[in-house]
Interface confidence: low
């Protein structure tokens, strides 16, 4: 996260870290006790399968206090139409091998009906973007959970205030952008998978996942997040299934 | 809201309570009524949520601790009366006035959901968890808010 | 009731150390909220130093950064300041104060010591 | 970082008299502002939270309203006691920055 601030211990508690062979490999969003929202990019390159580990209740990565729980990755699931390498369907299900237990550190996300999360939360302006990546472009990662308010574009604002880059992969109805085009704030690398939280009347709720960008807080471009909306009746279906033998499982989409 | 207040026993209340704090227990020897002592308590200790005329729509307003209730006249609804119970009441609109989820029907008024481990309440727009850890909510915060002693 | 106390010298001289500590009663420096330091020059406005939140993290103003750090003393319910190769430009009102932070932002004051002047001057 | 600009600078005003007083931000804060007061040899009070809350204890003559980048402290009916100095408080972006302030002194 560039130009955000510390996340409060405790105040993130859905938010996931995903460890690969230990180390830090990309956020996530709690959504149930079993299930957690990724990004589908994170898995790209992923060997070992049976070595991902998901965290929650972290805090800082350089100390543990006692309210972090770890949980093996027992599924990864891929919409079928996400291409590794591209930006596209950059979605991913996750089920836990154990359930979680909740605590105070320790919370889902509200994964929101379709037509609630299209016609209301999608105009709420601000959200917020969490993750322990990058606090500046090529820079460091964080070892405290950071956060940012975000502002939320039309598709159609975002292309007219983007400065064109020849080879910028398409924006498409999958995704929405969100940020400041002037360099000063943006989710950065590391924090992929992590949730784009909207609060809506007192409640929060999973709006998108960081997905993309053109570095990070670069001058005229924003950061790009899948739109979770797209997806929710496809992330229901599959959470209400019989498990499935294999890891990594591609599953057809819509 | 508490006018009556100002009248009873002026002379102990401004010596106990406004010019120095004073405890429930020092107020009920002021009030010699629990009832009353508790209206002024709910007031005195957190300031009266009142204050601010929450309530729309010609809805009268109750202080509470840290809180407040609405009773709002027959055409309206929500929390601070804000809702109006008519023809504009569908879910495009103000997401129908919904603290979640909407649904329309033809024919008839639209009706509000909750998420699971939330239940309706009985203005029929509010949620109210049903279980210790429901989603979407930070408890340390909850917590926090919940127990906060307000300054004065 | 929450209650702040500022102590600390009244005089530094200029290259050296500012010190200051805040004492609060009535309420636990751990349980929650931003405990801030903000200054006063003489005739002036106010500008934030920096705070240290409950949990320890803290966040110091850009301009001060490098000369300011703030911490806490959970034992005896107190946080300290300390403002490095302090100049006369540092001579001010200091005052500690506690801020209840929402989630996002917001950092709206509701406590207040009552402030410690501290003049810089050889 | 976010200045806040507030005006007037001093305004002269008499008891019973409204006061409005301004402060605009140089960029967008949403509704991210809050007010204090200030008298002589005190620290500062806070008043308004949040553009338009008021603080537990505040009296209802004073007022918040705007959002973005103007706001006003409005005080309905000026009393003695109001007279002092008031500023504004970014509350929205790091670090969290305050107006110059504006001067209510007795006409």
């Known amino acids: 996260i560039v130009g955000g601030k510390v996340c409060p211990k405790g105040e993130c508690p859905w938010q996931v870290l995903l460890l690969v062979n230990g180390a830090q490999l990309c956020g996530g969003t709690l959504i149930n006790t079993i299930w957690v929202v990724s990004a589908a990019h994170c898995f790209d390159k992923i060997k070992n399968w049976r070595n991902l580990i998901a965290v929650l209740g972290e805090h800082d990565l350089s100390e543990h206090d006692g309210d972090e729980q770890s949980r093996r990755v027992a599924q990864v699931i891929i919409p079928s139409t996400y291409v590794p390498g591209t930006t596209n369907h950059d979605i991913a299900l996750l089920r836990l091998h154990q359930p979680v237990v909740l605590t105070d550190h320790v919370v889902p996300l509200c994964l929101p009906e379709r037509t609630f999360s299209e016609r209301t939360l999608a105009f709420v302006r601000f959200s917020l973007v969490s993750g322990w990546g990058q606090l500046l472009d090529r820079g460091a990662t964080a070892l405290e959970l950071m956060v940012l308010n975000v502002p939320r574009l039309m598709t159609q604002d975002c292309l007219q205030q983007s400065r064109k880059v020849g080879d910028s992969p398409n924006i498409t109805e999958y995704m929405f952008c969100a940020g400041y085009s002037d360099g000063s704030k943006d989710s950065c690398k590391g924090d992929s998978g992590g949730p784009h939280a909207t609060h809506y009347r007192g409640t929060w709720y999973l709006t998108g996942i960081v997905s993309w960008g053109q570095g990070c807080a670069t001058v005229g471009h924003f950061g790009v997040y899948t739109r979770v909306s797209q997806y929710i009746e496809w992330l229901q279906k599959l959470m209400r299934s019989e498990p499935r033998p294999g890891v990594l499982l591609r599953a057809p989409f819509p | 809201a508490n006018a009556f207040l100002e009248e009873l026993r002026p002379g102990s209340l401004e010596r106990e309570c406004k010019e120095e704090q004073c405890s429930f227990e020092e107020a009920r020897e002021i009030f010699k009524d629990a009832e009353r002592t508790k209206l002024f308590w709910i007031s005195y200790s957190d300031g009266d949520q009142c204050a601010s005329s929450p309530c729309q729509n010609g809805g009268s307003c109750k202080d509470q601790l840290q809180s407040y209730i609405c009773f709002c006249l027959p055409a309206f609804e929500g929390r601070n009366c804000e809702t109006h119970k008519d023809d504009q009441l569908i879910c495009v609109n103000e997401n129908g006035g919904c603290e979640q989820y909407c649904s329309d029907h033809t024919g008839t008024k639209r009706s509000c959901r909750c998420h699971e481990g939330y239940s309706l309440l009985a203005d029929g727009v509010s949620c109210t968890p049903t279980v210790e850890y429901p989603c979407g909510k930070i408890p340390i915060l909850e917590k926090r808010n919940a127990s906060k002693p307000q300054g004065r | 009731q929450v209650q702040l106390q500022e102590s600390g010298p009244g005089l530094v001289k200029p290259s050296q150390t500012l010190s200051l500590t805040c004492t609060v009663s009535?309420?636990?420096?751990?349980?929650?909220?931003?405990w801030s330091w903000i200054r006063q020059p003489p005739g002036k406005g106010l500008e934030w130093i920096g705070y240290?939140?409950?949990?320890?993290?803290?966040n110091y103003n850009p301009s001060l950064k490098s000369r300011v750090t703030i911490s806490v003393d959970t034992s005896k319910n107190q946080f300290s300041l300390k403002l490095s190769s302090v100049t006369a430009a540092d001579t001010a009102v200091y005052y500690c104060?506690?801020?209840?932070?929402?989630?996002?932002?917001?950092?709206?004051?509701?406590?207040w010591g009552q402030g410690t002047s501290v003049t810089v001057s050889s | 970082e976010i200045v806040l600009t507030q005006s007037p600078a001093t305004l002269s005003l008499s008891p019973g008299e409204r006061a409005t007083l301004s402060c605009r931000a140089s960029q967008g804060i949403s509704d991210y502002l809050h007010w204090y007061q200030q008298k002589p040899g005190e620290a500062p009070r806070l008043l308004i939270k949040?553009?338009?809350q008021p603080a537990t204890g505040i009296p209802a003559r004073f007022s918040g309203s705007g959002s973005g980048t103007d706001f006003t402290l409005t005080i309905s009916s000026l009393e003695p006691e109001d007279f002092g100095v008031y500023y504004c408080q970014n509350g929205h972006s790091f670090p969290l920055t305050f107006g110059a302030g504006t001067k209510l002194e007795l006409k």
């Open positions: 104060a506690r801020s209840v932070n929402y989630y996002g932002n917001s950092f709206a004051v509701g406590y």
């Open positions: 009535g309420y636990s420096i751990s349980s929650d909220s931003a």
């Open positions: 240290i939140y409950y949990s320890g993290s803290t």
């Open positions: 949040y553009t338009s």
